[in-house]
C-alpha cells in the first residue's frame, strides 16, 4: 500500500507564438481544478478507460480575473498535493492524465459551469520512495510543469511497497536473517511470509505462501526477467525448481538506480540504464531536456536545451500529444465501409471486412453464403443470390459481427450522449459531470461524489473508482 | 460508399404537415452516432434542427425552436424521418439529412449529408 | 446562444490569404467543440475543420482552425478559385439538453 503525489508547479501559456486567452475575463471570473487518472502499466489506453490504479480531484484554486489588455499569465493554482492511494503493489511503470478543469463563476443558471481546458498524458517508470521527479507537458498551447513520486505507507517499503518493516524488538539489530528497514533504520524487515525464496524486489504476497511476480518478471519465485528466455548468468546454486541458476548477491541488489532507472552489472560495478527525464549516475537528476529523449513514437524534439527551457515534440503522422504520445483517432471517421473494422497500424489505415464484403475500404459485396459463416453462433439463410444472418442473441448486422447496440442501455449519465465506437462506446458528459459514464459530479468544493468503498479500502480512498 | 439521400418534400400548404424520410446506404444507423436534419432557407444561413441516437435507445435533441412541431424518429437501421406539422411560409427550405460522429472528444461533427429536400410552403 | 461571423462577404485574390472569424456569445463545449463547413451553391455543406482546429479528412493543409472558448478564427492561405463558397462556423452546447448552432456564414469571394 501506498500514496502516489502529484505536485502542481505552474500551469499557463507554453513557449512560442500563439500565446492562449485567458480562460477568465472580468465579465467571467473562473478558477482551475485538476484530476488525475492513473494506470497500470505502460499502457495506450483511452481518455476514457477506467483508472485501475486511482484517480483523484485537486481543491479549486483561487479566483482569478484577467487583466484587461494583459497577456495570459501562469494561472493561480489550487493549495496542497493530489494524493491517490494505492492498495496493492506500486507497479513501477505506469501512465498517467492529468486533466485541467476551469469552474465558470459568472452568474450562470443553475451554479457554476465546468470546461476542460487541457488533458496532457504520459507513461512513466518510477520506483517507490525516490525523489520527487520534475516533468514538463504541453497541450496545445498550454504547459503544466508537475513533478510526482509514489511513497509507501508503512509498514510497507521498498521500491514496489511490497516489503513489510516492523518496529525491532532489540534495540540493538534485527532477528537472524532480518535486514534493518531503509529509511526507516530503527525498523526492521518482518518476517517473510511469502513462499520461501521469493523474491522480495520483484515478488509479493498477499497470502502467505504465496509468490506474486511484479511486471516484467516471472518464475516461481519472480526471478526470471519476462524478456529472458534462457537462464540468468550463473552465479549461483542451481534451482530445482526452474532448472535455472539463481542469482547471488550483487552490485544491483537493492537496485541502486533512482526514478525507476534500471541497473545492469559491469566487470567492475553497475550502470543505470536511466528513464526519459532521469540521468546521472544512479539517474537522481531530473529536468525533462532533448537530451533525455522525451518524445514518444519518432517524434523530433526541438528546443529544450536546459531542463528549465521547454521542448516541443513534432510528432510523425499518426501521433499527437505534448510528448506524441498519443494515438491519432483517425478510425473516428469511419472510413471502412459496410460495417468493416478499421485498425490504424500507424503507417496505414487496414480494414477488416465483415463476411459478404471485400476491398479496401470493403465497398465490394459478395453477396452469398458460400464459403462464408456468421459470425457468434449465427446461422446463414440463402435466398436470391444474396444471403442473410440469423443471429445468436446478443448479437446483430449482415453476419452477426455486431454486437449489440452498446448504448442501447443508455449507460451515459446526467445527460451524457453516447456513442458507438470501434473500441465500444464512449460518453460525451454534459458540463459538472466527469468520468467513463458521466456518474460522477464535480462538485464546487472539489470533492467527487463517489461510492462508498468497499471492504478493504478506506472511506477516504474513493476516487480510485473515478 | 456511404451515402444520405433525403426524400418526401414538395409543395405543402400553410398549416399543412410534411413527412420527410433520410435514407442511408453503406453503413447503418447503428454502427454510427447520431442522425440529424439541418435546413437552410433560400439565401440564408445553417439551421440545426434535431437530432436521434443511431442505436435502439432513440435518444433525441431538438433546436427550441423546433420542440413541439417537428418529431425526429428511427424507422429502420437505415431510415430516419422528420415529421413537421402547422407548417408556415418561414418553414420554406432545402431540408439535409446529416450524421454526427464523435471525434476526439468532440461532438456534432456532420461528416456525411445527403443532398436535400426542397420544402416549399405556400398558399 | 448566438455565435457571429465576421466579416462577409470577404473577398482577396489568388494566392492570396482570407481570415474569417467567429464569435461564440458563450463558451462552446468543452471550450473546443466548434466546426468550419464549406458550401458551395447547390451543394450540402462539407466537414473541413474540427475541435477547432483539427483538420477533416482529405481537407488541405491550407485550412487552419484556431482559438477556444469564444473566439474562433478560420484561415484559408494560398487561395485557389476552387475556395470560392460560403463558410460556416458550428458550436455545441449544453443547457438542460444538447443543442448546436450555426454562424450566419461568410461568403469568400476569389479574384
Known amino acids: 500500500a501506498g500514496v502516489f503525489e502529484l505536485q502542481i508547479h505552474s500551469f499557463g501559456p507554453g513557449p512560442g507564438p500563439g500565446a492562449p486567452r485567458s480562460p477568465c475575463s472580468a465579465r467571467l471570473p473562473c478558477r482551475l481544478f485538476f484530476r488525475v487518472c492513473l494506470k497500470p502499466g505502460l499502457s495506450e489506453e483511452a481518455a476514457e478507460s477506467p483508472c485501475a490504479l486511482g484517480a483523484a480531484l485537486s481543491a479549486r484554486g483561487p479566483v482569478y480575473t484577467e487583466q484587461p489588455g494583459a497577456p495570459a499569465p501562469d494561472l493561480p493554482l489550487p493549495d496542497g498535493l493530489l494524493q491517490v492511494p494505492f492498495r496493492d503493489a506500486w507497479p513501477g511503470t505506469f501512465s498517467f492524465i492529468i486533466e485541467t478543469w476551469r469552474e465558470e463563476l459568472g452568474d450562470q443558471i443553475g451554479g457554476p459551469a465546468w470546461s476542460l481546458l487541457a488533458r496532457v498524458a504520459g507513461r512513466r517508470r518510477l520506483a517507490a520512495g525516490g525523489p520527487w521527479a520534475r516533468d514538463i507537458q504541453r497541450a496545445g498551447a498550454w504547459e503544466l510543469r508537475f513533478s510526482y513520486r509514489a511513497r509507501c505507507e508503512p509498514p510497507a517499503v521498498g521500491t514496489a511497497c511490497t516489503r513489510l518493516c516492523r518496529p525491532r524488538s532489540a534495540p540493538s539489530r534485527c532477528g537472524p536473517g532480518l535486514r534493518p528497514c531503509a529509511p526507516l533504520e530503527d525498523e526492521c524487515e518482518a518476517p517473510l511470509v511469502c513462499r520461501a525464496g521469493c523474491s522480495p524486489e520483484h515478488g509479493f504476497c498477499e497470502q502467505p505462501g504465496e509468490c506474486r511476480c511484479l511486471e516484467g518478471w516471472t518464475g516461481p519465485l519472480c526471478t526470471v526477467p519476462v524478456s529472458t528466455s534462457s537462464c540468468l548468468s550463473p552465479r549461483g546454486p542451481s534451482s530445482a525448481t526452474t532448472g535455472c541458476l539463481v542469482p547471488g548477491p550483487g552490485p544491483c541488489d537493492g537496485n541502486p538506480c533512482a526514478n525507476g532507472g534500471s541497473c545492469s552489472e559491469t566487470p567492475r560495478s553497475f550502470e543505470c540504464t536511466c528513464p526519459r527525464g532521469f540521468y546521472g549516475l544512479r539517474c537522481e537528476v531530473s529536468g525533462v531536456t532533448c537530451a533525455d529523449g522525451p518524445c514518444f513514437n519518432g517524434g523530433l524534439c526541438v528546443g529544450g536545451a536546459d531542463p528549465d527551457s521547454a521542448y516541443i515534440c513534432h510528432c510523425p503522422p499518426g501521433f499527437q500529444g505534448s510528448n506524441c504520445e498519443k494515438r491519432v483517432d483517425r478510425c473516428s471517421l469511419q472510413p471502412c465501409r459496410n460495417g468493416g473494422l478499421c485498425l490504424d497500424l500507424g503507417h496505414a489505415l487496414r480494414c477488416r471486412c465483415r463476411a459478404g464484403f471485400a476491398g479496401p475500404r470493403c465497398e465490394h459485396d459478395l453477396d452469398d453464403c458460400a464459403g462464408r459463416a456468421c459470425a457468434n453462433g449465427g446461422t446463414c439463410v440463402e435466398g436470391g443470390g444474396a444471403h442473410r444472418c440469423s443471429c445468436a442473441l446478443g448479437f446483430g448486422g449482415r453476419d452477426c459481427r455486431e454486437r449489440a447496440d452498446p448504448c442501447a442501455a443508455r449507460p451515459c449519465a446526467h445527460g451524457g450522449r453516447c456513442y458507438a465506437h470501434f473500441s465500444g462506446l464512449v460518453c460525451a458528459c454534459a458540463p459538472g459531470y466527469m468520468g467513463a459514464r458521466c456518474e460522477f459530479p464535480v462538485h464546487p468544493d472539489g470533492a467527487s461524489a463517489l461510492p462508498a468503498a468497499p471492504p478493504g479500502l478506506r472511506p477516504g480512498d474513493p476516487q480510485r473508482y473515478l | 460508399q456511404e451515402q444520405l439521400v433525403e426524400s418526401g418534400g414538395g409543395l405543402v400548404q400553410p398549416e399543412g404537415s410534411l413527412t420527410l424520410t433520410c435514407t442511408a446506404s453503406g453503413f447503418s444507423f447503428s454502427s454510427s452516432g447520431y442522425m440529424c436534419w439541418v435546413r437552410q432557407a433560400p439565401g440564408k444561413g445553417l439551421e440545426w434542427i434535431a437530432c436521434i441516437s443511431g442505436g435502439s435507445s432513440g435518444d433525441t435533441d431538438y433546436a427550441n425552436w423546433a420542440k413541439g412541431r417537428f418529431s425526429i424518429s428511427k424507422t429502420s437501421s437505415t431510415t430516419v424521418t422528420l415529421q413537421m406539422t402547422s407548417l408556415t411560409v418561414a418553414d420554406t427550405a432545402t431540408y439535409f439529412c446529416?450524421?454526427?460522429?464523435?471525434?476526439?472528444?468532440?461532438?456534432?461533427?456532420?461528416?456525411?449529408w445527403g443532398p436535400g429536400t426542397l420544402v416549399t410552403v405556400s398558399s | 446562444q448566438v455565435l457571429t461571423q465576421t466579416p462577409s462577404p470577404v473577398s482577396a485574390a489568388v494566392g492570396g490569404t482570407v481570415t474569417i472569424s467567429c464569435q461564440a456569445s458563450q463558451s462552446v463545449y468543452n471550450n473546443n467543440n466548434l466546426a468550419w463547413y464549406q458550401q458551395k451553391p447547390g451543394q450540402p455543406p462539407k466537414l473541413l475543420i474540427y475541435?477547432?482546429?483539427s483538420l477533416a479528412s482529405g481537407v488541405p493543409s491550407r485550412f487552419k482552425g484556431s482559438g477556444a472558448g469564444t473566439q474562433f478564427t478560420l484561415t484559408i492561405s494560398d487561395l485557389e478559385c476552387d475556395d470560392a463558397a460560403t463558410y460556416y462556423c458550428?458550436?455545441?452546447?449544453?443547457?438542460?439538453?444538447?443543442?448546436?448552432?450555426f454562424g450566419g456564414g461568410t461568403e469568400v469571394v476569389v479574384k
Open positions: 475541435a477547432a482546429s
Open positions: 446529416a450524421r454526427d460522429v464523435y471525434i476526439d472528444s468532440t461532438i456534432f461533427n456532420f461528416n456525411l
Open positions: 458550428q458550436g455545441t452546447y449544453y443547457s438542460s439538453g444538447w443543442y448546436s448552432t
